[in-house]
């Protein structure tokens, strides 16, 4: 057999057979590669639902290449059919001549029958392939219209967007001179605000000297009053004399003992000076008062005569205290006290005080905190905290706040902060917002000292979370 | 096995004293905080002192301070309570307990108690 | 001094049945909280500390939850050898305990 194509049917094949004088001529149909096999949800049509349209690289090439494999199969089965054909033919045509020639035309013609049923089979099943590619080609070239149109829609939104960064770079521009502008006014008051400052310093200096002068002066009366307690006190002894001698010399049987005028003393420094010089409770008296008041005086460290003005060892007294408590004084000299804010109030606003702040661990350290000026303001000015000068071992930071803060009480909040800090980590102090301190908070024994927000706390010395085991404050004139 | 056994309990007049013991087995005493908690009759139970491992810290309850005064001997494995100026609301079952190891207050294991009776 | 207040003060429970005991603080002891359990004539056991944690050898029924100011302890299957008084205990502030629940047979 031999293998042909007619140039004016190029898409076809002819399969000849030449058996003796007949000769068979088939027509067959041949791939031209516009087919595709039918697929099942290959991919996502709708392809306006996705941000990027789904693209499968080369699918038309992947997919013609897989039918041209399909049509070699076809063909070579079609070789192997007509293979049979000959070789049938071959015995058929032998036994034919032997029977008769005229059973020949009709057994030829039966094959051919049979031949071409099969091939009009095989061409129907190409006319299916082919549609189902005609198919898929135009779903291709609607996914590619709905990528088109998704392209020009991302196309636009990049203009409007090139055209809005284009007015926002505008109004940028525009906002840049508003604040170079606002700078230079800025410029301009930081400067005048300058001028003040310096102004103001000139005026706080000659307000310091004149402050300094009046110290001095205040001092120097301090001296000349006790200089006329001294005389006073001499002279009520040589009358309360006179007047013992006046009474013997008048009734020899009703002698009058003269009361002797007990002398009063501020603060434990004058306690200290008089001669009194063992650790104790004393009595003191508020300056240009007649009241009293009881203090623990230490007589022993760092000199002597310090007046100690809270204390905290074992957790016996409760320092969670009103505003009155806390003004006039509470728990026990000889253990655990506050000494009262308006005793050291008057007291440091006479002369210049020192404070010290004795602090212990857990863990048998000590430390000290010492101001060389301390004072509190009036109950008026809620007992306000003055502090100046930091030296000592307990932090190079003041634990009190500065520029000192007033006092504050579970039933005084005057504090910074819109919690009242007196309420949630206990005990009056000078809180701030709420500060690295409180030396009258919650007493924690040992074990239970850490991590504890509300305990006896110096921030700067053992942290936030750590509550101290014992605590001292104790003043003492600077000039001591 | 840890044990602990309490003694020196029984009547007393009010104003007396007592010397309570304990006596610890099967486990380090001077590894352990020890404390004493009392159980009134019928009624619930209340810490009434504690003593650090070395004795250098001790803690009492308001109600007994400048009265009662817990100590230890580590040596002899041992714990007191000495109780003085007795008053009829100290009569109590009185537990010695082992702190549990690192803990602030953890009563791990107790003894079986001593009754103290303050009565006239 | 921070109070312990328990409720309710007796509970009556079917034996198998489930068992909740509360717990009050007067304020925050974070989770600073245990549970002991005493029986008659003999001293406390500890069941649970830390709110949640169980002590060596206790049972699985035993659960404890809760932090802050308010805790539970539950038994979900009462054993004839769980009635008894149970007291819950802060160690956050100094010691103090609850005035117990006791729980019986119903």
């Known amino acids: 057999s031999n293998q042909r194509r007619s140039p004016e049917n190029s898409g076809r094949r002819y399969n000849r057979i030449q058996h003796g004088q007949c000769a068979y001529t088939f027509i067959l149909p041949e791939h031209d590669g516009n087919c595709r096999e039918s697929t099942t949800d290959q991919y996502n049509t709708n392809a306006l639902q996705r941000d990027a349209p789904h693209v499968e690289p080369d699918f038309s090439s992947q997919k013609l290449q897989h039918l041209e494999h399909v049509m070699e199969n076809y063909t070579q089965w079609l070789q192997k059919l007509e293979n049979y054909i000959v070789e049938n033919m071959k015995s058929e045509m032998a036994q034919i001549q032997q029977n008769a020639v005229q059973n020949q035309t009709a057994v030829m013609i039966e094959i051919g029958t049979n031949l071409l049923n099969q091939t009009a089979e095989q061409t129907r099943k190409l006319t299916d392939v082919e549609a189902q590619v005609l198919n898929q080609t135009t779903r291709l070239e609607l996914q590619l219209l709905e990528h088109s149109l998704s392209t020009n829609k991302l196309e636009k939104q990049i203009l409007d967007q090139t055209s809005e960064i284009n007015k926002l770079q505008d109004k940028n521009s525009f906002l840049e001179k508003k604040v170079l502008a606002m700078e230079d006014k800025h410029i301009i008051q930081l400067q005048s605000i300058k001028e003040e400052k310096d102004q103001l310093q000139v005026l706080v200096s000659k307000q310091n000297s004149i402050i300094e002068e009046l110290e001095k002066k205040i001092v120097t009366a301090t001296v000349n009053n006790s200089v006329l307690q001294k005389q006073q006190h001499d002279l009520m002894e040589t009358v309360n004399n006179l007047l013992t001698m006046m009474s013997t010399s008048n009734s020899a049987k009703d002698p009058t003992v003269a009361k002797e005028e007990q002398i009063s003393f501020r603060d434990c420094a004058e306690v200290f000076k008089s001669g009194h010089t063992t650790n104790g409770i004393y009595t003191l008296t508020f300056p240009n008062s007649t009241e009293e008041i009881k203090a623990y005086c230490d007589m022993e460290a760092g000199g002597g005569g310090w007046t100690i003005i809270q204390r905290r060892e074992d957790g016996s007294v409760d320092f969670q205290r009103t505003w009155k408590e806390y003004k006039v004084g509470f728990g026990n000299p000889s253990g655990e006290y506050w000494l009262g804010n308006e005793f050291v109030s008057q007291l440091t606003n006479q002369q210049r005080y020192v404070l010290k702040i004795h602090l212990k661990d857990w863990e048998g350290n000590e430390a000290y905190s010492l101001y060389e000026h301390f004072y509190l303001s009036s109950e008026e000015l809620n007992y306000r905290i003055h502090l100046k000068g930091l030296t000592g071992t307990a932090g190079k930071i003041s634990s009190i706040s500065q520029p000192g803060n007033d006092f504050s009480t579970k039933d005084g909040d005057n504090d910074k902060c819109i919690c009242k800090c007196s309420q949630m980590l206990t005990g009056g102090w000078w809180f701030d917002a709420c500060g690295p301190s409180n030396l009258n908070g919650m007493y924690y024994p040992q074990r239970q000292n850490t991590n504890k927000f509300n305990g006896i706390k110096w921030y700067y010395w053992k942290g936030s979370g750590y509550s101290l085991k014992a605590t001292t404050m104790m003043i003492r004139p600077a000039d001591f | 096995e840890v044990q602990m056994v309490e003694s020196g309990g029984g009547l007393v007049q009010p104003g007396g004293s007592l010397r309570l013991s304990c006596a610890a087995s099967g486990f380090t005493l001077r590894s352990y905080w020890m404390s004493w908690v009392r159980q009134a009759p019928g009624k619930g139970l209340e810490w009434v002192a504690n003593?650090?491992?070395?004795?250098?810290?001790?803690y009492h309850v308001d109600s007994v301070k400048g009265r009662f005064t817990i100590s230890r001997d580590n040596a002899e494995n041992s714990l007191f309570l000495q109780m003085s100026s007795l008053r009829a609301e100290d009569t109590a079952v009185y537990y010695c307990?082992?702190?549990?190891?690192?803990?602030?207050?953890?009563?791990?294991?107790w003894g079986q108690g001593t009754l103290v009776t303050v009565s006239s | 001094e921070i109070v312990m207040t328990q409720s309710p003060a007796t509970l009556s429970v079917s034996p198998g049945e489930r068992a909740i005991l509360s717990c009050r603080a007067s304020q925050s002891i974070s989770s600073n909280l245990a549970w002991y359990q005493q029986k008659p004539g003999q001293a406390p056991r500890l069941l649970i500390y830390?709110?949640?944690t169980r002590a060596t050898g206790i049972p699985a029924r035993f659960s404890g939850s809760g932090s802050g100011t308010e805790f539970t302890l539950t038994i979900s299957s009462l054993q004839s050898e769980d009635f008894a008084v149970y007291y819950c205990q802060q160690y956050n502030y100094w010691w103090t305990f609850g005035q117990g629940t006791k729980v019986e047979i119903k």
């Open positions: 307990a082992r702190d549990m190891e690192a803990s602030a207050g953890l009563f791990d294991y």
């Open positions: 830390g709110a949640s």
């Open positions: 003593i650090k491992e070395d004795g250098s810290e001790k």
